[in-house]
């Protein structure tokens, strides 16, 4: 689809005459009729197949002509076309003189014919004017034309239709030959599909517009090249969408449980070595004088009761000092300077006097102790009850409260489940721990020996002097069959030969 | 042969929500060159473009009718759906699917035979 | 909002007669026309896109055209089986807009 335009520029007509010779009266009231149609090497009357225009009258005998495009388009002269511009053409221009107002042709004179002129050839189509003059003995025309596709029609023969658009089915304008030029960040045959923010993952990410990343489920971060781990993933990481890979030192399926407290929270204080025992459990082993769980507390030197004879500890900043009773001194209150005269034994101790009167001892009564038999003997502080057995202080003595499975005075005999003879066949019973074992004879099994199984009484060698063993299946016994000079039910005896 | 096979008709209470399909078959629902399309008509009525979906899940919709529908795309099983909700007897119609082609400047070239839609109380 | 009016409502004619159906929307020649066919109890059928062009299966008698302010389809020599409902389309940005339809129908 386009326009065949001519543009008509001058008519020269100086004698104001008609094709005839007869002058027009009173001068030749000149319009233009125009035929486009096919190539025709000679041009002929007929059809105008590419269509035809009139002008009204432009003026008389010799004029110039105006542009007119404000006017209905009267100059240049259009003649749309439908179809694929061929490249050749055949044009007709006649001018004619219109001696009243009606232009029909029906309405002219033959004779009012003023000049016709044909050309034909080759015309591309273009925004260049080509310039012609055609000159009769009578008159000239100049003249210009040109061929341009319609709107929204490209190429070289205004066949391509092409609408620019910027919408979903597509982004572009239309090149000169018809083709389609994208938008920016627009690519694809229809220009419909958006340019990714670069380096948006092809499977993982999309866009819906230019400079997107748009992540499919399952991945993130600017790129869409970040898997999504396992909802609650806590300490993991992940290499496809919802897996959850634990980082070092955390276990679970959240990667949850603290397989490493002592990394992750550092819990010993004061210097402790921690060593990790279990999921979020760990072990603080405190430096000398810390103490606690975490080895939080500093451990008092007054805790040990350092000071003897009744000497008061008090905690100083680099140790400990016993303040000592009248009559005591030294760095533990461990000197007296008291004698027996001075009844230091308390609870009904004996005094006894020691290096000639200088010093004494206190020989203390039973349930008592100390250098002054000050001290109450606590018969359990030494947890003389064996096996797990709990002590109790009884007055002057003390007695074990035994776990089950123990006995005797500090528990230290273990109670023979083996006592009733629980293995049958002549099993032999061994006490252990938590239960008995039975070691069964041969032919006998279970745990206690009452399952007969069969057995092949030869399997040990039972005979000598190379008899044949034989089983006596029914008994489970043997019978060796002996060689000559041997007797005894295992052929263990020779006898003499003559 | 590309063929677009909706789902069966709806009766619905006013309020309610619904949610028709439109199956492609002899094609895959996957390819660039076709955007995937819901038309409304009402008893004796004309056409209504209501939105499309291109198969990356991209959607367009007509304003008037934004608040109303959510249109989805299942790749794996080449099926493209409508979901309409808060109903009102203003809904009631006949709900085509089609195939909207690039290649023909976004017309309608392949057409379900239509889902009739009814909201009653 | 856009609007595409389509005239007349109704057109009524004779088996061969030559009709024309006309669409109309601001700048209407600078989109793609498409038009549709929608017999009786049928689904919309594709009978002209961009303009002019006719997808396969469409008969010849059926053409387009499309500038200025109008389109129009032209059936150039109508049967019966024409007879049906006829509606033309265009996209405004993103979105698709159909005219009111025109009603084919016999004398």
């Known amino acids: 689809s386009g326009v065949f335009q001519l543009q008509l520029q001058e008519f020269i007509n100086e004698r104001g005459v008609l094709a005839s010779g007869r002058p027009c009266e009173p001068g030749c009231r000149t319009f233009f009729r125009v035929c486009l149609k096919h190539f025709q090497a000679v041009v002929s009357p007929g059809p105008c197949t590419f269509g035809t225009v009139s002008t009204p009258v432009l003026g008389t005998n010799s004029f110039a002509v105006r542009d007119d495009s404000s006017g209905g388009g009267r100059n240049p002269l259009q003649l749309p076309f439908n179809f694929t511009w061929p490249g050749t053409f055949s044009l007709i221009i006649e001018a004619w003189h219109a001696p009243g107002d009606d232009l029909r042709p029906e309405a002219l004179p033959p004779d009012a014919l003023i000049s016709k002129i044909a050309i034909q050839g080759s015309l591309a189509v273009g925004q260049n004017w080509l310039l012609d003059e055609q000159t009769s003995t009578l008159t000239r025309l100049r003249y210009s034309y040109r061929v341009i596709c319609s709107d929204n029609y490209y190429g070289d023969n205004c066949s391509r239709l092409c609408k620019k658009r910027n919408d979903h089915f597509g982004h572009y304008v239309c090149q000169p030959d018809g083709n389609l030029s994208c938008l920016p960040g627009w690519t694809g045959e229809y220009c419909q599909q958006p340019i990714c923010l670069s380096g948006c993952h092809e499977q993982n990410g999309y866009c819906s517009k230019p400079a997107e990343c748009l992540c499919r489920p399952g991945w993130q971060g600017r790129l869409c090249n970040e898997c999504i781990p396992h909802n609650g993933c806590r300490h993991g990481t992940c290499s496809t969408p919802w897996q959850c890979t634990c980082d070092e030192g955390w276990g679970g399926l959240f990667c949850d449980q603290d397989l490493n407290y002592c990394t992750h929270h550092s819990p010993c204080k004061n210097g402790a070595t921690c060593s990790n025992s279990g999921q979020r459990s760990y072990t603080c082993t405190c430096r000398p004088g810390y103490t606690g769980v975490d080895c939080e507390l500093e451990l008092s030197e007054c805790d040990s009761n350092p000071c003897r004879n009744g000497g008061s500890c008090k905690d100083q900043e680099d140790g400990y000092h016993c303040l000592c009773p009248p009559g005591y001194y030294g760095l533990h209150c461990e000197h007296s300077t008291l004698s027996c005269a001075d009844s230091p034994c308390f609870n009904g101790g004996s005094c006894r006097e020691r290096n000639q009167g200088a010093n004494y001892a206190c020989e203390c009564p039973p349930n008592f102790t100390g250098s002054n038999c000050e001290k109450k003997v606590d018969r359990c502080t030494s947890n003389p009850c064996a096996n797990g057995g709990q002590c109790l202080n009884r007055g002057p003595s003390r007695m074990c409260r035994c776990r089950p499975g123990f006995t005797g005075t500090y528990c230290e005999l273990h109670v023979s489940d083996c006592a009733r003879n629980p293995c049958a066949h002549g099993g032999t019973c061994h006490d252990l721990e938590n239960g008995l074992m039975c070691t069964c004879p041969a032919g006998f099994s279970g745990r206690r020996c009452e399952v007969r199984t069969s057995i092949d009484a030869c399997a040990s060698s039972p005979c000598f002097n190379r008899a044949t063993c034989y089983t006596d299946l029914s008994t489970d016994t043997f019978v060796c069959n002996c060689p000559y000079g041997f007797v005894g039910s295992r052929c263990e005896f020779p006898v003499g030969l003559p | 042969q590309v063929q677009l096979q909706q789902s069966g008709a709806e009766l619905m209470k006013p309020g309610a929500s619904v949610k028709l399909s439109c199956k492609v078959t002899?094609?895959?629902?996957?390819?660039?060159?076709?955007?995937w399309g819901w038309i409304k008509q009402r008893p004796g009525h004309g056409l209504e473009w209501i939105g499309d979906i291109y198969y990356t899940g991209s959607t367009y919709y007509n304003p008037s009718l934004k608040s109303k529908v959510t249109i989805t795309v299942d790749t794996s099983s080449n099926t493209f759906y409508i979901q309409l909700i808060s109903l009102t007897t203003e809904d009631s119609a006949i709900y085509y699917c089609?195939?909207?082609?690039?290649?023909?400047?976004?017309?309608?070239?392949?057409w379900g035979q239509g889902t009739l839609l009814t909201v009653s109380a | 909002d856009y609007l595409l009016t389509q005239s007349p409502a109704i057109l009524s004619v004779s088996p061969g007669e030559r009709v024309s159906f006309s669409c109309s929307g601001q700048?209407?020649?600078?989109?793609?026309a498409s038009w549709y066919q929608q017999r009786t109890n049928g689904s919309p059928r594709l009978v002209i896109y961009?303009?002019?062009k006719r997808p396969s299966g469409i008969p010849s008698r059926f053409s387009g055209g499309n500038s200025g302010d109008d389109a129009t389809l032209s059936i150039n020599s109508v049967e019966s089986e024409d007879i049906a409902d006829y509606y033309c389309?265009?996209?405004?940005?993103?979105?698709?807009?159909f005219g009111a339809g025109t009603k084919l129908e016999l004398k």
């Open positions: 089609a195939r909207q082609a690039l290649a023909m400047g976004g017309g309608s070239d392949k």
């Open positions: 700048r209407l020649g600078d989109k793609y």
């Open positions: 961009e303009d002019s």
């Open positions: 389309q265009a996209w405004d940005r993103d979105t698709g807009v």
């Open positions: 002899g094609g895959s629902i996957s390819s660039s060159s076709y955007y």
